[in-house]
Interface confidence: low
Amino acid sequence: HPEPHTAELQLNLTVPRKDPTLRWGAGPALGRSFTHGPELEEGHLRIHQDGLYMVHIQVTLAICSSTTASRHHPTTLAVGICSPASRSISLLRLSFHQGCTIASQRLTPLARGDTLCTNLTGTLLPSRNTDETFFGVQWVRP
Amino acid sequence: HPEPHTAELQLNLTVPRKDPTLRWGAGPALGRSFTHGPELEEGHLRIHQDGLYMVHIQVTLAICSSTTASRHHPTTLAVGICSPASRSISLLRLSFHQGCTIASQRLTPLARGDTLCTNLTGTLLPSRNTDETFFGVQWVRP
Amino acid sequence: HPEPHTAELQLNLTVPRKDPTLRWGAGPALGRSFTHGPELEEGHLRIHQDGLYMVHIQVTLAICSSTTASRHHPTTLAVGICSPASRSISLLRLSFHQGCTIASQRLTPLARGDTLCTNLTGTLLPSRNTDETFFGVQWVRP
């Protein structure tokens, strides 16, 4: 096979968080982040190679304690395919409850053209520290 | 490509437990742990092949309840490159808050000679149970 | 190498939860789940190719809040080899404490014929939502 498509993204909050959608970025200005194959479109990741992918994410809430987290509950993170609309689905969902970090991963088939979106619902802001909040994919097999 | 370099390590508290650095070990005496390519140096993992790696970790605190965890907050786990000094960086960081286990993973480029260190700051002890605390890397692509 | 063996499973609660063993399923009726190589036997995953595997899991408790989780503590999730008996071992263990989701992953050697079992001890029920509870393996190397 050719080199597997991979990406590791950092949070790129260039505008006030008016909507729950997290916008991601990659490149030297954003720590050790990169895209090898997939592309970023308006802060979302677009897949360019069909196959089975390992999708992983970690999100840490900024200025957070277990008290903050429980007070502002529910704070939920969801990763899904948001376009094309015909393939829209939630792939991964976690709530923060009394914690300030969620981290998970899953294997899922993705198709060329699928765009992945990550939504953080609730009132708390995500941390932009490069070792606390990141999102990535790794192509595993056709 | 040659077989990908991989390692899965268990906690090996053979040195004073007085500094925050966790020391790891591998081999038959330590459960299902091994190193295939990377090497252990004084309990830290040294990379021997350039490339993109999936780094994963789970750490469980010993003799812990949510009350203990919140009382002893902040307890934080960080994984980073600690040498060479010129490449020193924190790759992954999580706090325990009211939980007794953290687990996460990320894709990150590593170079031959990079040494990975894991620091558990705070006052609680990590569990040495082989199914509760482990740390590993998997080479993914050049 | 041939295509790596992989599986991503969804919870398949077709019988009342009388015992702590979670039963898994795959296929179109259960979201984006599949088996490529490993096989399901009575809701457990049977390995058909020797090698090193990345095992990952996420389990979310149904109708759960941090209060529920702490009230019903201990609720613990364990993944292990349950047969053949000679290879029986716990590979991965996490407690929920005050959270409603656990997620983790680890590298572990598995052999053809190994059957993986997942046990959820405690009184709370797991969520069957396909984006909240899943279990998978990915062959990494021989």
Partner: antibody
Framework: EVQLVESGGGLVQPGGSLRLSCAAS????????MNWVRQAPGKGLEWVSD????????YYADSVKGRFTISRDNSKNSLYLQMNSLRAEDTAVYYC???????????????WGQGTLVTVSS | QAVVTQEPSLTVSPGGTVTLTCGLK?????????PTWYQQTPGQAPRLLIY???TRHSGVPDRFSGSILGNKAALTITGAQADDEAEYFC??????????FGGGTQLTVLG
């Protein structure tokens, strides 16, 4: 209820040996670090030694290093202190103490036995 | 001579407040010394009160509190009671791998 019961103390001549035992009950002995702490008559406390939960790692105070050996038998829920080359200044009540596990840096003793008296005198 | 210093004795009236301190012969005590406090009544084993500067052990009444005051660790008892009469030992982490205990403070509750 956590219980620690020491035994094996007594009168011994300088240069002699004694073996102290501590029987533990009421908790999962095999997950706790264990310690010996001593208290000379009318004096303060002195940490002597500790051993990790699996028995593979031991530490000693400088005053007893090379003379005392701490060990444990998790199958018997027992802690031991082998004391050789005893000196007059080793005279003390010896306590078996459980490390709470609250600290990755320093032993914190949350349960103690009632102690056993060791007298080193000619 | 002791590295960890404590007042040899202190007196308090019932219902009163008293502060016991724990210092270093040379240098200041900080939270990095993980100050721990134990109570010992005559003929009994010590009992853990406070650890990691200010965390009360389970079952310890909230009239006992720990802190850093200036360059010393402190144990404060508010609303002293007759059964608080005991010897109090502090312990500090100074160097690997041990803890160093102070000489103890004999607290008398007058009344």
């Amino acid at each position: 209820e956590v219980q620690l019961v020491e035994s094996g103390g007594g009168l011994v001549q300088p240069g002699g040996s004694l073996r102290l035992s501590c029987a533990a009950s009421g908790f999962t002995f095999s997950v706790y670090y264990m310690n010996w702490v001593r208290q000379a008559p009318g004096k303060g406390l002195e940490w002597v030694s500790d051993i990790n939960n699996e028995g593979g790692t031991t530490y000693y105070a400088d005053s007893v290093k090379g003379r005392f050996t701490i060990s444990r038998d998790n199958s018997k829920n027992s802690l031991y202190l082998q004391m050789n080359s005893l000196r007059a200044e080793d005279t003390a009540v010896y306590y078996c103490a459980r490390d709470a596990g609250y600290s990755n840096h320093v032993p914190i003793f949350d349960s103690w036995g009632q102690g056993t008296l060791v007298t080193v005198s000619s | 001579q002791a590295v960890v210093t404590q007042e040899p004795s202190l007196t308090v009236s019932p219902g009163g407040t008293v502060t016991l301190t724990c210092g270093l012969k040379s240098g200041s005590v900080t939270s990095d010394n993980f100050p721990t406090w134990y109570q010992q009544t005559p003929g009994q084993a010590p009992r853990l009160l406070i650890y990691n500067t200010n965390t009360r052990h389970s079952g310890v009444p909230d009239r006992f509190s720990g802190s850093i005051l200036g360059n010393k660790a402190a144990l404060t008892i508010t609303g002293a009671q007759a059964d608080d009469e005991a010897e109090y030992f502090c312990a500090l982490f100074i160097s690997n791998p041990s803890v160093e205990f102070g000489g103890g403070t004999q607290l008398t509750v007058l009344g």
